[in-house]
């Protein structure tokens, strides 16, 4: 059985068949006949009852209100009422794009990784018995596929597969021809399999500082979207009011990975901040990577080889 219309806000395109199905629909045949009502309210009118007398485009079933077809003036709030049960929806009917085979505002976007399995199946379970034929279009050019009832694409994705795929179902109702369009915007991206996250730069960094001044320790990593980057310092983080972790910054790389940066700001550097480890860690399901920073007084830097300094 077709699932009920549970979304409270719905956008549809003018001129297409459309239905609302309430969510108190009993699959078992009811023993007694129940009086049911559908209402519409819009800016100008309050609660107008919907039935075939109020509009010849309306058809009613046990659980469903059908529009043959839905039109711009059907925009409004809809209510289903039965005994003490009420359900409400807000319907927005948008104008059809007459210069294209689809309406941009009614597009579902999907991202597919190159070389991964890519599938488009044209199905419409509710109107299935009424559908005469279905066509699949790519960027509004008809694809010649064997099955004209449920055209399907099943393949490993290539970059050339990117585009707008429109399933158009043609159906007859009461001697009139209608169509229902479902469009997918398919974007093909590079392989997004997880990388082992890595912190950028040397594992140990000595930073020359002056007492009473401020320093910003920048920790950068290349990581996956779900990986985390954090600072560890002292016996318990947050005990030093002069140390602040800044907000993490992330930029997506062209390969679909993330470049993350997290700054530890130490203000009014004191003796207690010197010669202790400030550790930055990146953690993922595949493990962790850590790099360390040690603050040293500028006067003492002659004792340390120049190449280990981070300026």
């Amino acid at each position: 059985a077709e699932s009920c219309t549970s979304r409270p806000h719905i956008t549809v395109v003018e001129g297409e068949p459309f239905y609302l199905k309430h969510c108190s629909c009993s699959l078992a045949h009811e023993i007694e006949t129940t009086t049911k009502s559908w209402y519409k309210s819009s800016g100008s009118q309050e609660h107008v009852e919907l039935n075939p007398r109020s509009s010849s485009r309306i058809a009613l079933h046990d659980c469903v209100l059908e529009f043959w077809p839905v039109e711009l003036n059907d925009t409004g709030s809809y209510f289903f009422q039965m005994k003490n049960y009420t359900q409400k929806w807000k319907l927005n009917v948008i104008r059809r794009n007459k210069h294209s085979c689809f309406t941009e505002r009614q597009v579902t976007s999907k991202i597919v990784e190159v070389k991964k399995f890519f599938q488009i199946t044209c199905e419409n379970s509710y109107y299935q018995t009424l559908v005469n034929s279905t066509s699949l279009y790519k960027n509004c050019k008809k694809l010649l596929l064997e099955n004209n009832k449920n055209p399907t694409i099943k393949k490993n994705a290539e970059f050339e597969d990117q585009g707008y795929y429109s399933c158009v179902h043609f159906l007859h109702h009461n001697g009139k021809l209608f169509n229902i369009t479902k469009t997918f915007n398919i974007t093909i991206v590079e392989d997004r399999s997880n990388i082992v996250p890595v912190l950028l730069g040397p594992k140990l960094n000595h930073v020359a500082v002056e007492l009473g001044k401020n320093v910003r320790l920048n920790c950068s990593a290349l990581l996956n979207e779900e990986d985390v980057i954090y600072w560890m310092f002292g016996e318990e983080n947050g005990s030093d009011p002069n140390i602040h972790e800044e907000k993490e910054m992330r930029i997506m790389t062209p390969e679909g990975k993330w470049h993350a940066s997290k700054v530890l700001r130490i203000e009014n550097i004191g003796e207690s901040n010197l010669n202790v480890l400030y550790n930055c860690t990146v953690a993922s399901t595949g493990g962790t990577d850590t790099k360390s920073f040690i603050l040293v007084r500028k006067a003492d830097m002659a004792d340390i080889p120049g190449h280990v300094f981070t300026r």
Partner: nanobody
Framework: DVQLQESGGGLVQAGGSLRLSCAAS????????INWFQQAPGKERARAWV??????????YYVDSVKGRFTVSRDNAKNTVYLQMNSLKPEDTAFYYC??????????????WGKGTLVTVSS
């Protein structure tokens, strides 16, 4: 021969009751939603939808003007639908037609029609 036949119409005083029947022959009534339409005598206007019972018998829909006064029911074993009309008003005077269709819907979508029965309510 496939047909629908209404019966039970007649003359009744305002406030009175009538029970109309819609019997099918040559096809299974239980496969269809049964709609009732009214047409005022002498008016060649389109038949106006009044009420309907779904094929399952689980749902009934009524136009506001008859809600609480008219009740529809069906007996699929007898291939018949009944329309109980109570608290009748002079404005209910009309020819009543039953029609079988795929849904509770407009007249032009109906598959089978009866020939109609006249209900006259006098004041």
């Amino acid at each position: 021969d496939v047909q629908l036949q209404e019966s039970g119409g007649g003359l009744v005083q305002a406030g009175g009751s009538l029970r109309l029947s819609c019997a099918a022959s040559g096809f299974t009534l239980g496969a269809y939603a049964i709609n009732w339409f009214q047409q005022a005598p002498g008016k060649e206007r389109a038949r106006a939808w009044v009420l309907c019972i779904t094929s399952s018998g689980g749902s009934a829909y009524y136009v506001d003007s008859v809600k609480g006064r008219f009740t529809v029911s069906r007996d699929n074993a007898k291939n018949t639908v009944y329309l109980q009309m109570n608290s009748l008003k002079p404005e209910d005077t009309a020819f009543y037609y039953c029609a079988a269709g795929g849904a509770c819907a407009a007249a032009e979508t109906m598959n089978y029609w009866g020939k109609g029965t006249l209900v006259t309510v006098s004041s």
